[in-house]
């Protein structure tokens, strides 16, 4: 807490300007009127205040707005946002995308902080869903944002917002998240033609079921190995050698380099060695000729 001291004669601030950088903490506290500060917040970011001086300005705003700052002040916080705590931000009602953008701009390049996470949470909850404009903004500042959401939170993303998602936005998503996003992407891109559809859906395929992979294998898509390696193991296992060959096209040769890794390893174990040999890649570990394959999952389903 800064002690309450009288403002020295002639030092009362008439406006927020650069002369204030020469004020000591106690002079800022005594000589700057909180209401003046609130109306001239847009000037603060142009003035090279130290973090210590910003603490004093924050204290003045906190006293003026104990229930939380109005959006007119929030939009112009600038570097003062770096001094806010998640508790401060929980008191705010941010409705304008412009305000959100202004605050994310201050944090550009920073790691995702609890302050930013709280701000985004408040904003998205206020909107009711993660609409396309918001998602566009968030992923522009934080490419990993989408993958930081839980499957439950992702379920509120409307399919129309999927158009804003770039491949790099999904880099850190796990299979549970892709399980939620894939059906939305399929719906969003359903009216596109084959090759265009594949380009758009490719980064979401970690959530695709077997039947969709089978369908893609009939469309000459030439899936690359990096995408194939991210597919769900349980979705890959039922694919035949012929289907995988069609799915990968010229990239099928890459299976050899990945034969020890999932899902390739597990898929090989499910194929007849005869069928694997037709690829001419020297893949080993398939079911030897003459062995009977029992599908235990089907047996369990019947019982």
């Amino acid at each position: 807490e800064v002690e309450k001291t009288a403002c020295p004669s002639g030092k009362k601030a008439r406006e927020i300007d650069e002369s204030l950088i020469f004020y000591k903490k106690w002079e800022l506290e005594a000589c700057v009127d909180a209401a003046l500060l609130a109306t001239q917040m847009d000037r603060v970011n142009a003035i090279p205040f130290t973090y210590e001086q910003l603490d004093v300005l924050k204290h003045k705003l906190d006293e003026l707005y104990p229930q939380g700052y109005p959006e007119s002040v929030i939009q112009h916080l600038g570097y003062l946002f770096l001094k806010m705590s998640p508790e401060d931000i929980r008191k705010w009602n941010v409705t304008s995308l412009e305000t959100l953008k202004a605050l994310l701009e201050v944090n550009k390049g920073h790691e995702m902080s609890p302050q930013v996470a709280t701000l985004i949470d408040r904003f998205v909850k206020g909107r009711g869903q993660l609409d396309k404009d918001t998602l566009d903004t968030l992923t522009a500042f934080y490419p990993g944002y989408l993958c930081s959401l839980s499957p439950e939170e992702l379920s509120s993303v409307p399919p129309s917002s999927i158009w804003a998602v770039r491949p790099q936005d999904l880099d850190t998503c796990d299979p549970r998240q892709l399980d939620v996003l894939y059906p939305k992407a399929r719906l969003a891109f359903q009216n596109m033609n084959g090759s265009e559809y594949f380009v758009k859906i490719q980064s979401f395929l970690g959530g695709a079921p077997t039947e969709d992979l089978k369908a893609l294998s009939q469309q000459n898509v030439s899936m690359d190995l990096a995408t194939f390696m991210k597919l769900r193991t349980d979705a890959v296992l039922p694919l035949t050698v012929a289907e995988v060959q069609k799915l990968l096209g010229p990239h099928v040769e890459g299976l050899k380099a990945e034969e020890r890794h999932r899902p390739v390893r597990d898929w090989i174990l499910r194929q007849r060695q005869d069928d694997l040999d037709t690829l001419g890649l020297g893949l080993q570990g398939g079911i030897p000729n003459g062995y009977l394959v029992l599908d235990l999952s089907m047996q369990e389903a019947l019982s």
Epitope: P48, L54, H110, Q115
Partner: antibody, heavy 117, light 107 residues
Framework: QVQLVESGGGLVKPGGSLRLSCAAS????????MSWIRQAPGKCLEWISY????????YYVDSVKGRFTISRDNAKNSLYLQMNSLRAEDTAVYYC??????????WGQGTLVTVSS | DIQMTQSPSSVSASVGDRVTITCRAS??????LAWYQQKPGKAPKLLIS???RLQSGVPSRFSGSGSGTDFTLTISSLQPEDFAIYYC?????????FGCGTKVEIK
């Protein structure tokens, strides 16, 4: 008086790791943001990272993002820089500095990191 | 990133001379500029913050001016202990960036 003393530098092979420390005294460490700045031999100064007093706000320059991790222990008045996947271009004198927002008001003497095979 | 360009890269001067060093920012940084002095084998030392605010304990022969993109550090009467490298640094936006220095040498 304010004092910052870096340690932990040395010779390391490319791909190796080092952990730098900065011991602070003469001020209330937990009240201040702290930064790491480096200077390659005969080159410009390069600010590489900072951390807020509470550790909630962190920034890395692109050249070290994903390889370096800044942290602090306010109870021990110490700032750290964990450096992984080191490259020849990371060879520099590393300074810790007290960061007051508009400038760095106090600097340590620096610790030399040499990355070479 | 904001680029900081210092000129000249070196200057030869005599004791008692007036020396002026300039720093130009690639975009408007208002007055978010600091100047530092570095002597061989030593850490940089803060001279001026906020473009013109003299740091406590720094001799008054040092002064800073400028705003926007063009800034100046002036040493009104060079002293023997002033031979060093001088750096400017912007703090208007992240990442903070430094100029590459101006070396003040003995003529």
């Amino acid at each position: 008086q304010v004092q910052l003393v870096e340690s932990g530098g040395g010779l390391v092979k490319p791909g190796g790791s080092l952990r730098l420390s900065c011991a602070a005294s003469g001020f209330t460490f937990s009240d201040y943001y702290m930064s790491w700045i480096r200077q390659a031999p005969g080159k410009c100064l390069e600010w590489i990272s900072y951390i807020s007093s509470s550790e909630s706000i962190i920034y890395y320059v692109d050249s070290v993002k994903g390889r370096f991790t800044i942290s602090r222990d306010n109870a021990k008045n110490s700032l750290y820089l964990q450096m992984n996947s080191l490259r020849a271009e990371d060879t520099a004198v590393y300074y810790c500095a007290r960061d007051v927002g508009s400038h760095f008001d106090y600097w340590g003497q620096g610790t030399l990191v040499t990355v070479s095979s | 990133d904001i680029q900081m360009t210092q000129s000249p890269s070196s200057v030869s001067a005599s004791v008692g001379d007036r020396v002026t060093i300039t720093c130009r920012a690639s975009q408007d940084i208002s007055r978010w500029l600091a100047w530092y002095q570095q002597k061989p084998g030593k850490a940089p030392k803060l001279l001026i913050s906020a473009a013109s605010r003299l740091q406590s304990g720094v001799p008054s022969r040092f002064s800073g001016s400028g705003s926007g993109t063009d800034f100046t550090l002036t040493i009104s009467s060079l002293q023997p202990e002033d031979f060093a490298i001088y750096y400017c640094q912007q703090a208007k936006s992240f990442p903070r960036t430094f100029g590459c220095g101006t070396k003040v040498e003995i003529k």
